[in-house]
Interface confidence: low
């Protein structure tokens, strides 16, 4: 017989020879990283018709890495469905938890043993340090030192010392987010007051008042024979200016070649989304939470 067959999981014991006599036997062993489970034969004999008797490496099984349980508050997912060497184990954490350690472990051979490439990671609760304190304002739960994932705080402004109140600029409610940071920057509390908007040859049609504070909205229309140059709606913004700027009412030209504008407004109309005042499961600002009486 010529040289005996070769296998992926099994190797010849001893050195192969170019030729073997009829009746001569060769023995195999499982390769490194494989282990033998009986009863399949791991030897063969040179038959009298000069071929080897059938033999297979199906009794040699890949070494397996130890089973790893899901981490507490997370999940371990086998990329290719088995724990054999070469396997990849991927780790993910549940919502509200973050991974400490490697997110992928590999089943590797060390000497003849299959072991994981490192220690399984941990899923640790997402925690935030207290949110920033703000000038002229405060936030709820100022006595709490450790905030958990999605814990929320609500900011409010202090009473102003003068005649004009402090306005809250930014998000009034922020929450502890995914990477242990707060969902938004802390808002600021400051006096925002826009000048009285005067439009000659026109009049205010909404937003009447003597003082115009943050997010005050005013709408205008022009007198007959005048058209609006600018937006018909303006909003008092955080830098105490109107946005868009206060419009003008221009005289409609009587020249037959000039076509007067048909629209009462031009330019973009700003939209204003009021700040979120509470988050599911958290108290509303008007439920007394802003005025905790003892701390």
């Amino acid at each position: 017989c010529e040289a005996p067959p070769t296998f992926e999981a099994m190797e010849l014991i001893g050195k192969p020879k170019p030729y073997y006599r009829v009746g001569e036997r060769v023995d195999y062993k499982c390769k490194k990283g494989y282990f033998y489970i009986p009863p399949l034969a791991t030897h063969t004999i040179c038959d009298r018709n000069h071929t080897w008797l059938p033999v297979s490496d199906e009794g040699c099984y890949r070494e397996m890495c130890p089973h790893i349980r899901d981490p507490l508050n997370g999940e371990a997912i086998l990329a290719n469905g088995s724990y054999e060497f070469g396997a990849e184990l991927h780790f993910i954490c549940n919502e509200g938890y973050y991974l400490i350690g490697k997110d992928i472990l590999y089943c590797e051979l060390k000497d003849t043993v299959a072991i994981w490439s490192g220690k399984p990671p941990l899923c640790e609760k997402i925690l935030c340090t207290p949110p920033p304190k703000i000038k002229n304002g405060k936030h709820t739960f100022s006595e709490v030192e450790v905030f958990e994932y999605l814990d929320a705080v609500t900011y409010s402004c202090d009473p102003a010392p003068g005649p004009d109140p402090f306005s809250l600029i930014g998000e009034s409610m922020i929450y502890c987010g995914n990477n242990s940071t707060w969902s938004h920057a802390a808002p600021e509390c400051k006096v925002v007051k826009c000048r009285f908007p005067v439009v000659e040859n026109g009049k205010q049609i909404s937003g009447f008042g003597k003082k115009f504070y943050y997010k005050a909205t005013v709408m205008f229309e022009c007198d007959k024979g005048y058209y609006l140059n600018g937006s018909d709606k303006i909003v008092c913004e955080s830098n105490s200016t109107w946005d868009p700027p206060v419009p003008k009412c221009l005289k409609v030209s009587t020249s037959p070649t000039t076509k007067s504008p048909t629209s009462s407004a031009s330019g973009p109309r700003p939209t204003y989304k009021p700040p979120v005042s509470n988050y599911p499961g958290y108290p509303k600002p008007d439920e007394g939470i802003l005025n905790n009486l003892d701390d």
Epitope: E124, K125, L127, T129, F141, E143, V144, E145, V146, E148, D151, G281, Y282, P283, G288, I289, N292, L293, D294, D295
Partner: antibody, heavy 116, light 109 residues
Framework: QVQLVQSGGGVVQPGRSLRLACAAS????????MHWVRQAPGKGLEWVAV????????YYADSVKGRFTISRDNSKNTLYLQMNSLRAEDTAVYYC?????????WGRGTLVTVSS | QSVLTQPPSVSGAPGQRVTISCTGS?????????VHWYQQLPGTAPKLLIY???NRPSGVPDRFSGSKSGTSASLAITGLQAEDEADYYC?????????FGGGTKLTVL
Amino acid sequence: QVQLVQSGGGVVQPGRSLRLACAASGFTVNNYAMHWVRQAPGKGLEWVAVISYDGNNKYYADSVKGRFTISRDNSKNTLYLQMNSLRAEDTAVYYCAKGGGYFDLWGRGTLVTVSS
Amino acid sequence: QSVLTQPPSVSGAPGQRVTISCTGSSSNIGAGYDVHWYQQLPGTAPKLLIYGNNNRPSGVPDRFSGSKSGTSASLAITGLQAEDEADYYCSSYTSGTWLFGGGTKLTVL
């Protein structure tokens, strides 16, 4: 004035249940995290359970997990600790306490004795 | 066995300075969580003595002070007085669990 008044302690047989109450005055319990802490006779303090201000999060010490339940009745401004399957090692003075990371107000404590 | 380790007892003469140590680990004090101290006079409920490592609630004398470094913290009491004789507990936090030290009995000689 701001205080916590406790009730519900007593002698109980192993395996039985008991409910402790902690009535708050001078502040609203649902604005704060509220805890239970216990102290076995002659021993140190052991944290037992907490309920977050919104009631959505409850945490327990491993020694009581699955047996004790912390709850709150906002209308009565009262905190509760329902203790089931009591064991001899649960014998202790139980304190309710207010606060987040630290406990700035404590009840006077109520003695729970588990004995046959 | 407590996760936070305190000496079982300390003592000092009136007017002296004593310190009580509290040793934790990288998962509690060493992870950046604050340390708080409670005083328990015989037969009474504990009382907050120091919060946030070194802050005193109103009404606590400035003879009491706290500090924190790495995985440990300490409480210092200066000008020891007879009424300071009590049990003292340190406290901190780790994921979802509030921790107490085993307590230290302070004896005023």
